[in-house]
Structure formats: structure tokens, C-alpha cells
């Protein structure tokens, strides 16, 4: 039988990772609900310990014994200002055992004290049993990865911790080493590297500076704000909307816990849709007193909300060069860890201070640490897989790459066995009159919605200057060099403003036999797929159409060519087709077809009559032949036929 | 004035063939779209589809995809149905009718008989 | 499929007396941009082609005589004739065009 693998956990603060390296590769691993994080959060009840998802999901209820936040405590005094601080915030009650901290809980009718240790050996217990539900066989070998500034006593009692929960703790890294190491950045091969690694998770911010030179890495700084993350972001929107919801029902809800964390969890799960999209709605029913709240808010304004706590992020960055005694362009790479870097406007931030540079974010910044401990594992396992020390090369793109258009159509710039390297460009525009940006979303995957496929990684391309729908020209190239390192760019054409990602191969991607899977459904669902393309195809087009037909009878040059009943015939049929639209997105391929050919039946005579006898051809962009491809309330993008 | 007259309907049997034409006059041919209904004996009217006059864009109902076909000649003023594969139960009075805001202006309509 | 249900199938009045013909569709015509609701009525004479009454619901179509209205808005819709006349005995026919185009089984109305 082959030798047990060892496993790497990140032990985090407000949720915690596990990952293994086997069959060349890094397995984030999932827990029992599916989730590849699970909450370090354990809850005490009169029947039983829970730890998890189950012990965050019944916190509400069951406040002063539900324990978070253990790695705040652990291998600290009791006295210590931090501790005596925290205190402050938590709902559950922290007693004094000879100067050490200790959680007092009742638990099965009984109270219960437990060291932090004991804890955080529950969290990594769980840990332990979700590698072990997945691999089949029991583990015991682990590497546990905590905060560069955590000292001795910290890194000892979290060792402890994993005794405790029956593991053989191979070593303690750096959680900010364990990032470099999953971007492989201790093996570029080109001497001495600084790394700055900007970690913000859901209760700390964590800015590390490490220098690595021949496989050896150095900490020279750290900065950051031990209580700065998602969490706080959560209280601002908790905040705004417990306002709104004063303003709209004269209630202040503030003093409901229920309705308080129930509006949390809502507010939580927005701020993560507005990563990925410039709207999130909320809906809760019976929030308060019976009263549904059904609100939305933008990425915008989120984005205010949070201003002064995304521009503080900065400030130790700054800190941290001047301790490291660096400037900022001797930084050679940056590297993202941490969900709440998932935010565009804190990525821009710190993308902007470093005047552009390319951020490594291709692997989930969530797991990013986890991905990093488990290839440590592995080394100190004495895995001589090649993968372990280098790389995998690819020669061939093993999925077509693409990006999503418009519905939520998969547009391939880069066919599935492509040799590479390779590089392809196309043509985009905008979805809507005077969008200010595009949203690239980069995918992997052989099915016709990108729902159903691999996403990679997404960036914004922004300042596009006011235009009707359709008038501008986003060039989207994918380069893929002999590494399999994908690099997209999208560059708008009439300013030369360009936008890019760098998503690296065997990163958060799909294994030979998930490629080989989805390869085969592709097969099998090619059929349905294929109706669901020409269905959003002829939605797109009848929605192109319209738009157009209506901006071309609008248009000031047309005045005194285009008679008032024939415009207002034109306008009243792109009125009825739009609105119809908007009530009819889930409508058969049929249904949009025919409307657009009614639409063509009504506009085309009357647009043709205008340009007969002008010497030129019909106007540009009037066919039928629309977009192919919108779904979120992201910036869309469409493709140019 | 607008003038629809349908023609080519007759006696064919199951399996068979017929190409039923409509000419429109009195208007723009292009300018309107033309449908396609159909009446059984004794039946009610049943929609069988129409064809965008502009473009030559048919669309079917669902009943009539596969063997029924639209066409136009707009340097006539044409319409036209060609059926394949007929069956007894295609026997029917077949009208064109000019679509507006509705079906403003219909044929006289032409008899479709399928037996053996 | 947008499926229209008429009733009655038939109905006798007297001459000069109101008549009333239901239209039920499976899902709403209304198109709330326009505001207006996508149905009209034909009316088919004995061996004669269907003729166009009334659109959008309440549209009279020209030439029409104006004892022939349409009411209703959503799923549900009525012709009625006010004053019958002889030359009305006919069958009327509803049709949706709200999404492709279906017609309403028919009623047949006759003098009582």
C-alpha cells in the first residue's frame, strides 16, 4: 500500500483549510457540507459538541457557547492587553486559570472550561476527519501553518494543539512562507526574490515581506492590524442596512440579536456576491416584527462603506517596506492570500500603489496557505515527485479557455488541445449604453454556459469611455507561454487602457481525470447545451436588435429623413419587443426568434428606405445577428461578430 | 385596395405532395409580414406559421416543423406553402393573412384534400 | 404554449340583445412596457374568410361598427356585441400575439 499522505492545515482565525499533495498535485479538500473552508468555530450544547459549519450555523441561538476566535488566545496570558481586549467583543465568557485564558461553557447542563489549546484541537480534529473522509485511511502527519509574528509560546501551544487532536505536527511554517511556497515562488530559479504577501481574512490583515533565496526563506517584516477583515466589512454593511431599515420602517433592529445575525449572514453572503458582480440583493423574510427586508446594494457603494478601512490596508504595506528597508520596485512579486482579497477594490488598491504590478491571486486566496503547507508536507515526507519540486509543463491546453459573454455563454478564445504556446485575440464590446467597464471573467471547460465550466480568474477593465451599447472595442487576447502560464489581457481600443490577469496551470485547475470527466459530460450534455446556446444566441440577438433599431430611429441625423409615425412605428415595436424581453428572459429560442423577425418585419423596410439611394450600404451592427452570450449584474461583455 | 388570392390547393394523396401559393397586391409586399392559417373541416383556424416578406425568415408553429416549408418571390408579390409528406388529416382550407397589428387582411383561401 | 380557452362554445341570442364571448389565456398577455394586452378577435361568417374586429384588446379595426367592444386585460378578456344584428351570426374567434400566435377554439354565436 502506498505511504500515507501528509496533510497541511491553516489554522486560521475565522475559518480554516486542509489540503494533501497526491498524484502530482494539491486536493483543497472539502468538508461534509461541500464547503473547502470550514468556520474554527466549536459550539457546546446541552446534547452535544458541534465544530464547523454545524456549530457557526446555530450561533445565533446559542451565543455564550459558541467559541470563535481561539486564535486570539492561544499561547497568550491572560493578562495580556490583547486578551483583556478581546474579552471585550465576545459573547462567550473567558475566565483567569493562573494567569492562562480558559473558555467557560455549559455544556450537557454542566459547566466546562477548556484551555484554548483544547479548542483549537477540536478545529484541527475536524480538520484531521475531513482528510481522512477523503483519502479513505487514517492521518496522522500534518503541517500547521500560523501568523509570522505568532512567537514561541504561540507556534508551541499550537503544536500542542495538534497533539491534542492526535497529529504528528511535522513542523510549524509560516502562514505568509506557505503562500510563497504554493506559488512555487521559492523555485523561480532566478536568485534572490522579495515577496510581499498581503493576507486580509475575515478577522486579521496579515502583511508579511520575505525574501527568498535558494529554496530559503527570511522574514523581514511583518505589519498589519490583528483586528482588520471580512468581518468588519460585514459590520458596515450590518450597519447601513440596520439604517435603511429605519429609514423604511421606522424600527431600529439593532437590539434583535436574532435579527441582527440573521442580517449579518445576509450581508456576509452580499459582500462575497460583490466580488464578482456590481449588485448584490438581500432578502429576508420576516427580518423583524414580520417585516420582509428585501433591499440590494452596489459594489459602489459598498465600496464607500468600506473606504477607509480598504485605504488602511496601505498603511501597513508602507510599514513593512520601511521595516524591510525596501522600496516598493524592489518587490518582485506580490501575492494575495486571504477571502477578503477577493475584493476588486482592494485589489486595485494595492495594485495601484505598486504602480500596475501583476498580483499572484491564481489560486484561491482562501486556500492559498492550506495549498502551500500541504506541498510542505509532502517535501517533508520526502516526496520526490517531480511535481513537488518543479511544475508540471504542459504542451497542450488540456480545456478550451475562454471568457463569459453576455447570458452566460462561454466564448472560446483557445480550443481544448491546442498546442501551446498559443495566443489569440478577438474583438468585444460593451452590453449596455455607456458602460463604464467590462468584466473578464476567464474560464476553462467544454460546456456552452460558463455556469458549468472552471472559473479562473476574472479582472475589470474600467474608464471606458460613455458610448451606446455595442460602440466599443475591447481586444481580449489569451496567451498561453510554453509553462502553460495563461496571461489575459483586455485592452480598450480607443484609449489603449488595458487590464490583465496571470492565471498559472495546476493551480486551483482541474486534475487529468476531472478533465477527462468533464470531457466526457461535455458529450453527454452537448445536446442540451447546444439548445441553451442558440436560445440565449436568439435573446441576445432580439435584445441587440431592438437596442439598435431604437439608438438608430433616436438618432439626431436621422432628423427630417425618418418620418414621425415611421419613427414612432420603429419605437413603439422596439418598446414592446424590450419590455416583452424583460418579462420573457427565460422564453424558448423560438419565441425570441419569431419576435425578432416580427421587429425586422416592422423596422427594416423603414431603416432600408433611408439609406436607399444614400451611395452607401444599410447602417453597421443593424442585423439580426447579435451578441453571442449576460447573465450577472457585473459589467457585461459581448462578443462582435 | 389590398387583394389576397390564394392557389394550388386540390385533391393529393397521403404521402404526396402540393405547393400552395398566395399573391398579395394593392400594397408593399415587404412591408408586412405573411401568415399562414389553417381551417379543418368543421374545425377551428390553426395557426401554421409565417414568413417575414423582408428577410424570407419563416417561422413555424410547432405542429407544422419539418414538413412545411415558406417561401416568397417578392419580385411577384408571392407566397408560398409547399407541403411534403402529406397526411389525411392536413385536409383543410388554407388562408394567407397580412399581419399589422393583427391578421388585417386574409385570402379567400384554397381547399386542401388528402385521400387515397 | 399560450393556450386560449373560449366559452361558451355556442350561444343564442335575440336580436337586438347583448352578446358575450370569454377569453381565457393559460398565462398573461400584457406587455407592461406598452401597457397594452396582445389579443384581438376575428370573426368568420359561414364559407367566408375570418375577418379582424378588434386588436389589442379593445382596438376596434376600421370599419368595424362600434356595437363590437373588447374589455379585459391579463389572463381574461370578453368580446362583447351590444346590439346583436343578423349579419353578426358568425363564429368568433380570439388569438394571442404575445408570444407567437395561437387562436382561442372558437364560439358560435346564432340568433335565438
Known amino acids: 500500500m502506498a505511504k500515507a499522505a501528509a496533510i497541511g492545515i491553516d489554522l486560521g482565525t475565522t475559518y480554516s483549510c486542509v489540503g494533501v499533495f497526491q498524484h502530482g498535485k494539491v486536493e483543497i479538500i472539502a468538508n461534509d457540507q461541500g464547503n473547502r473552508t470550514t468556520p474554527s468555530y466549536v459550539a457546546f450544547t446541552d446534547t452535544e459538541r458541534l465544530i464547523g459549519d454545524a456549530a457557526k450555523n446555530q450561533v445565533a441561538l446559542n451565543p455564550q457557547n459558541t467559541v470563535f476566535d481561539a486564535k486570539r488566545l492561544i499561547g497568550r496570558k491572560f493578562g495580556d492587553p490583547v486578551v483583556q481586549s478581546d474579552m471585550k467583543h465576545w459573547p462567550f465568557q473567558v475566565i483567569n486559570d493562573g494567569d492562562k485564558p480558559k473558555v467557560q461553557v455549559s455544556y450537557k447542563g454542566e459547566t466546562k472550561a477548556f484551555y484554548p489549546e483544547e479548542i483549537s484541537s477540536m478545529v484541527l480534529t475536524k480538520m484531521k476527519e475531513i482528510a481522512e473522509a477523503y483519502l479513505g485511511y487514517p492521518v496522522t502527519n500534518a503541517v500547521i501553518t500560523v501568523p509570522a509574528y505568532f512567537n514561541d509560546s504561540q507556534r508551541q501551544a499550537t503544536k500542542d494543539a495538534g497533539v491534542i487532536a492526535g497529529l504528528n505536527v511535522l513542523r510549524i511554517i509560516n502562514e505568509p512562507t506557505a503562500a510563497a511556497i504554493a506559488y512555487g515562488l521559492d523555485r523561480t530559479g532566478k536568485g534572490e526574490r522579495n515577496v510581499l504577501i498581503f493576507d486580509l481574512g475575515g478577522g486579521t490583515f496579515d502583511v508579511s515581506i520575505l525574501t527568498i533565496d535558494d529554496g530559503i526563506f527570511e522574514v523581514k517584516a511583518t505589519a498589519g492590524d490583528t483586528h482588520l477583515g471580512g468581518e468588519d466589512f460585514d459590520n458596515r454593511l450590518v450597519n447601513h442596512f440596520v439604517e435603511e431599515f429605519k429609514r423604511k420602517h421606522k424600527k431600529d433592529i439593532s437590539q434583535n440579536k436574532r435579527a441582527v445575525r440573521r442580517l449579518r449572514t445576509a450581508c456576509e453572503r452580499a459582500k462575497r456576491t460583490l466580488s464578482s458582480s456590481t449588485q448584490a440583493s438581500l432578502e429576508i423574510d420576516s427580518l423583524f416584527e414580520g417585516i420582509d427586508f428585501y433591499t440590494s446594494i452596489t459594489r459602489a457603494r459598498f465600496e464607500e462603506l468600506c473606504s477607509d478601512l480598504f485605504r488602511s490596508t496601505l498603511e501597513p504595506v508602507e510599514k513593512a517596506l520601511r521595516d524591510a528597508k525596501l522600496d516598493k520596485a524592489q518587490i518582485h512579486d506580490l501575492v494575495l492570500v486571504g477571502g477578503s482579497t477577493r475584493i476588486p477594490k482592494v485589489q486595485k488598491l494595492l495594485q495601484d500603489f505598486f504602480n500596475g504590478r501583476d498580483l499572484n491571486k491564481s489560486i484561491n486566496p482562501d486556500e492559498a496557505v492550506a495549498y502551500g503547507a500541504a506541498v510542505q508536507a509532502a517535501i517533508l515526507m520526502g516526496d520526490k515527485s517531480e511535481n513537488v519540486q518543479d511544475l508540471l509543463l504542459l504542451d497542450v491546453a488540456p480545456l478550451s479557455l475562454g471568457l463569459e459573454t453576455a447570458g452566460g455563454v462561454m466564448t472560446a478564445l483557445i480550443k481544448r488541445n491546442s498546442t501551446i504556446p498559443t495566443k489569440q485575440t478577438q474583438i468585444f464590446t460593451t452590453y449596455s449604453d455607456n458602460q463604464p467597464g467590462v468584466l473578464i471573467q476567464v474560464y476553462e471547460g467544454e460546456r456552452a454556459m460558463t455556469k458549468d465550466n472552471n472559473l479562473l480568474g476574472r479582472f475589470e477593465l474600467s474608464g471606458i469611455p460613455p458610448a451606446p451599447r455595442g460602440v466599443p472595442q475591447i481586444e481580449v487576447t489569451f496567451d498561453i507561454d510554453a509553462n502553460g502560464i495563461l496571461n489575459v489581457t483586455a485592452t480598450d481600443k480607443s484609449t489603449g487602457k488595458a487590464n490583465k490577469i496571470t492565471i498559472t496551470n495546476d493551480k486551483g485547475r482541474l486534475s487529468k481525470e476531472e478533465i477527462e470527466r468533464m470531457v466526457q459530460e461535455a458529450e453527454k450534455y452537448k445536446a442540451e447545451d447546444e439548445v441553451q446556446r442558440e436560445r440565449v444566441s436568439a435573446k441576445n440577438a432580439l435584445e441587440s436588435y431592438a437596442f439598435n433599431m431604437k439608438s438608430a430611429v433616436e438618432d439626431e441625423g436621422l432628423k427630417g429623413k425618418i418620418s414621425e409615425a415611421d419613427k414612432k412605428k420603429v419605437l413603439d415595436k422596439c418598446q414592446e419587443v424590450i419590455s416583452w424581453l424583460d418579462a420573457n428572459t427565460l422564453a424558448e429560442k423560438d419565441e425570441f426568434e419569431h419576435k425578432r423577425k416580427e421587429l425586422e418585419q416592422v423596422c427594416n423596410p423603414i431603416i432600408s428606405g433611408l439609406y436607399q439611394g444614400a451611395g452607401g450600404p444599410g447602417p453597421g451592427g443593424f442585423g439580426a445577428q447579435g451578441p453571442k452570450g449576460g447573465s450577472g449584474s457585473g459589467p457585461t461583455i459581448e462578443e462582435v461578430d | 385596395e389590398v387583394q389576397l388570392v390564394e392557389s394550388g390547393g386540390g385533391l393529393v394523396k397521403p404521402g404526396g405532395s402540393l405547393r400552395l401559393s398566395c399573391k398579395a397586391s394593392?400594397?408593399?409586399?415587404?412591408?408586412?409580414?405573411m401568415n399562414w392559417v389553417r381551417q379543418a373541416p368543421g374545425k377551428g383556424l390553426k395557426w401554421v406559421g409565417w414568413?417575414?416578406?423582408?428577410?424570407?425568415?419563416?417561422t413555424y408553429a410547432d405542429d407544422f416543423k419539418g414538413r412545411f416549408t415558406f417561401s416568397r418571390d417578392d419580385s411577384k408579390n408571392t407566397l408560398y406553402l409547399q407541403m411534403n409528406s402529406l397526411k389525411t388529416e392536413d385536409t383543410a382550407v388554407y388562408f394567407c393573412?397580412?399581419?399589422?397589428?393583427?391578421?388585417?387582411?386574409w385570402g379567400q383561401g384554397t381547399s386542401v384534400t388528402v385521400s387515397s | 404554449e399560450i393556450v386560449l380557452t373560449q366559452s361558451p362554445d355556442s350561444l343564442a341570442v335575440s336580436l337586438g340583445e347583448r352578446a358575450t364571448i370569454n377569453c381565457k389565456s393559460s398565462?398573461?398577455?400584457?406587455?407592461?412596457?406598452?401597457?397594452?394586452?396582445?389579443l384581438a378577435w376575428y370573426q368568420q361568417k359561414a364559407g367566408q374568410s375570418p375577418k379582424l374586429l378588434i386588436y389589442?384588446?379593445?382596438t376596434r379595426e376600421s370599419g368595424v361598427p362600434d356595437r363590437f367592444s373588447g374589455s379585459g386585460s391579463g389572463t381574461d378578456f370578453t368580446l362583447t356585441i351590444d346590439s346583436l344584428q343578423a349579419e353578426d351570426v358568425a363564429v368568433y374567434y380570439c388569438?394571442?400575439?404575445?408570444?407567437?400566435?395561437?387562436f382561442g377554439g372558437g364560439t358560435k354565436v346564432e340568433i335565438k
Open positions: 389589442w384588446t379593445s
Open positions: 414568413i417575414n416578406t423582408y428577410t424570407g425568415e419563416p
Open positions: 398565462q398573461s398577455l400584457l406587455n407592461s412596457g406598452t401597457r397594452k394586452n396582445y
Open positions: 394593392g400594397y408593399t409586399f415587404t412591408n408586412y409580414g
Open positions: 388569438k394571442q400575439s404575445y408570444t407567437l400566435y395561437t
Open positions: 393573412a397580412r399581419y399589422d397589428h393583427a391578421m388585417d387582411y
